[in-house]
Interface confidence: low
Amino acid sequence: VPGEAEQPAPELVEVEVGSTALLKCGLSQSQGNLSHVDWFSVHKEKRTLIFRVRQGQGQSEPGEYEQRLSLQDRGATLALTQVTPQDERIFLCQGKRPRSQEYRIQLRVYKAPEEPNIQVNPLGIPVNSKEPEEVATCVGRNGYPIPQVIWYKNGRPLKEEKNRVHIQSSQTVESSGLYTLQSILKAQLVKEDKDAQFYCELNYRLPSGNHMKESREVTVPVFYPTEKVWLEVEPVGMLKEGDRVEIRCLADGNPPPHFSISKQNPSTREAEEETTNDNGVLVLEPARKEHSGRYECQGLDLDTMISLLSEPQELLVNYVSDVRVSPAAPERQEGSSLTLTCEAESSQDLEFQWLREETGQVLERGPVLQLHDLKREAGGGYRCVASVPSIPGLNRTQLVNVAIFGPPWMAFKERKVWVKENMVLNLSCEASGHPRPTISWNVNGTASEQDQDPQRVLSTLNVLVTPELLETGVECTASNDLGKNTSILFLELVNLTTLTPDSNTTTGLSTSTASPHTRANSTSTERKLPEPESRG
């Protein structure tokens, strides 16, 4: 063709896959009449007629472009729809008149790859491998043209390095003409790479310019030998009896070695293996003082059979022993004195307190409690509390009962009980003394006795209210070796409508809707109003 040697470079048209390419025929009016043009595609030096323009009307030629071509811009532009990678070629338009001239267009096609998919080597990498091992694989699917891959470790790009870093990339062409890129990063890793973050980046071009996509970051399992094993105890800090204590072995190797935890036998100083749970943790629950001692961990590498021993760790389970009080069961006459002494052992310094059991009142801070001029009221429970102030919750207690010799002492001297005729009453009478008294009643009924504490007794009587009983009342008598004492219960009739009898006379309420011979509670211990206790 005349003048072909001076052909200018083709015009570049860039378009993304799937969009429409506008191929504008750049022939000037002097070079040819645009109403009479032939369009060709050039592939491997071969021209193929794909479209004719005659008198401004376009006609597709049969073939691969038949359905995708149309004329635009008054016939100066050929529109190619649904562009594919196979469309990346030269298109030319050729004017027929006044003389044959042609205009060349280079169509460039682009497609962004999908997000890169990174897969780490699940088997991991030993640090002492002789040559680079596969770290991860990066796949970028359906890009055009082939994207470039850059590998990063901890944000820094990795370069090929002999015997250290090797990047092996390959690509496949899909039936769509798009490329799938696979890049394998191989590297020799060191122990410090156990936390290294690797990712790959795909660099690609679009008509709008250069772009990139990054994969997620991954870490690769790195295997390195154990250099040190050690013990860890939870909770941290002072331990006490009753705590849940966990002793676990840890190692700086991956995978960790097979662990066994031993406790030194205090008599032979030999290590005796302890039974751990499925996770290799020795659980002491509840911890006891016998668990104190020297523990160590052995880590056995099952591949090399190399065994490592931890530094021994002393475990101290703090304790307070059983508290002993002397005398253990004191008995005293009224007016005499008593010294109570409390003793206990502990792994730490102890504090002692004496409390009155009935009231919780602190009587003494120290191991010795002195009681002088003992009165009957001084009888009862005294509790010694031995505690370790530096370890909250570590304490033991012992209760001692002080008995004051004396005749029975009644909880009340006399009392009114409001009743209805023919009800079964439940009466109660309480007395204390040392020796502990027994209680008898002056009427027939079902009586039962309960020991409240070493000096106190409670007797209950079930009795049917009769006219005679209303007249005589009920007496309970408490007796011991040192004497006897009596309480009287006066029975008063009450109407069913009476809710609260005269507050000056009552100390117990006995209303009931029960029919004859049913039980109503009318106990001498059930009080609506306070009343000073009467002494016998």
Partner: antibody, heavy 121, light 107 residues
Framework: EVQLLESGGGLVQPGGSLRLSCAAS????????MSWVRQAPGKGLEWVSA????????YYADSVKGRFTISRDNSKNTLYLQMNSLRAEDTAVYYC??????????????WGQGTMVTVSS | SELTQDPAVSVALGQTVRITCQGD??????ASWYQQKPGQAPLLVMY???NRPSGIPDRFSGSSSGSTSSLTITGAQAEDEADYYC???????????FGGGTKVTVL
């Protein structure tokens, strides 16, 4: 009563092989590590090799490593020492001993009577 | 690692004799002591901090300090005449070592 009885000793030429056995009774064999200890004529005791109760771990003195192999058959209550590439300096009485392996010490609390191995051309 | 013992000591009948064993491994591990009479297998006489197997007379006692371990026979008897060997794990913890032995003669 704990008893250990060695057998398999004898005269062998340098470079030859020998297999020693130690039959154990009177205790739970698999619960104890076992060791071989030797004593050259007129010399002191020398530890040779040890094996854990399960047989999973084995240990060797540097002087025999690569030539001797310790093993055990817990079903037969028997300890073995396979000796290959024997040298004149391996000539000794070989004792098997029960090895009480603690964290702070190792104790041979029971010993066999020994079997004599002579390596000579 | 090595354990060092005096080759020989003598003691008058009824007197006290102390045999020592030295080595770096004894900073980490206790020694065990064995008695061996001519033509017999060794016999364990002391192990751990100061533990005596049953059947061993209480005239045998043990002690340990730093890199030295000692076996003491208080009131030596004629039947105590024998070679005594100390033993320990080596510093690696996996191997066993014996001392060269001490010949005790009861005069």
């Amino acid at each position: 009563e704990v008893q250990l009885l060695e057998s398999g000793g004898g005269l062998v030429q340098p470079g030859g092989s020998l297999r020693l056995s130690c039959a154990a009774s009177g205790f739970t064999f698999s619960s104890y590590a076992m060791s071989w200890v030797r004593q050259a004529p007129g010399k002191g005791l020398e530890w040779v090799s040890a094996i854990s109760g399960s047989g999973g771990s084995t240990y060797y003195a540097d002087s025999v490593k690569g030539r001797f192999t310790i093993s055990r058959d817990n079903s037969k209550n028997t300890l073995y020492l396979q000796m290959n590439s024997l040298r004149a300096e391996d000539t000794a009485v070989y004792y098997c001993a029960r090895d009480v392996y603690g964290a702070t010490s190792s104790v041979f609390d029971f010993w066999g009577q020994g079997t004599m191995v002579t390596v000579s051309s | 690692s090595e354990l060092t013992q005096d080759p020989a000591v003598s003691v008058a009948l009824g007197q006290t004799v102390r045999i020592t064993c030295q080595g770096d491994s004894l900073r980490l591990y206790y020694a065990s002591w064995y008695q061996q009479k001519p033509g017999q297998a060794p016999l364990l006489v002391m192990y751990g901090k100061s533990n005596r197997p049953s059947g061993i007379p209480d005239r045998f006692s043990g002690s340990s300090s730093g890199s030295t371990s000692s076996l003491t026979i208080t009131g030596a008897q004629a039947e105590d005449e024998a070679d005594y060997y100390c033993s320990s794990r080596d510093t690696s913890g996996n191997h066993l070592v014996f001392g060269g032995g001490t010949k005790v003669t009861v005069l």
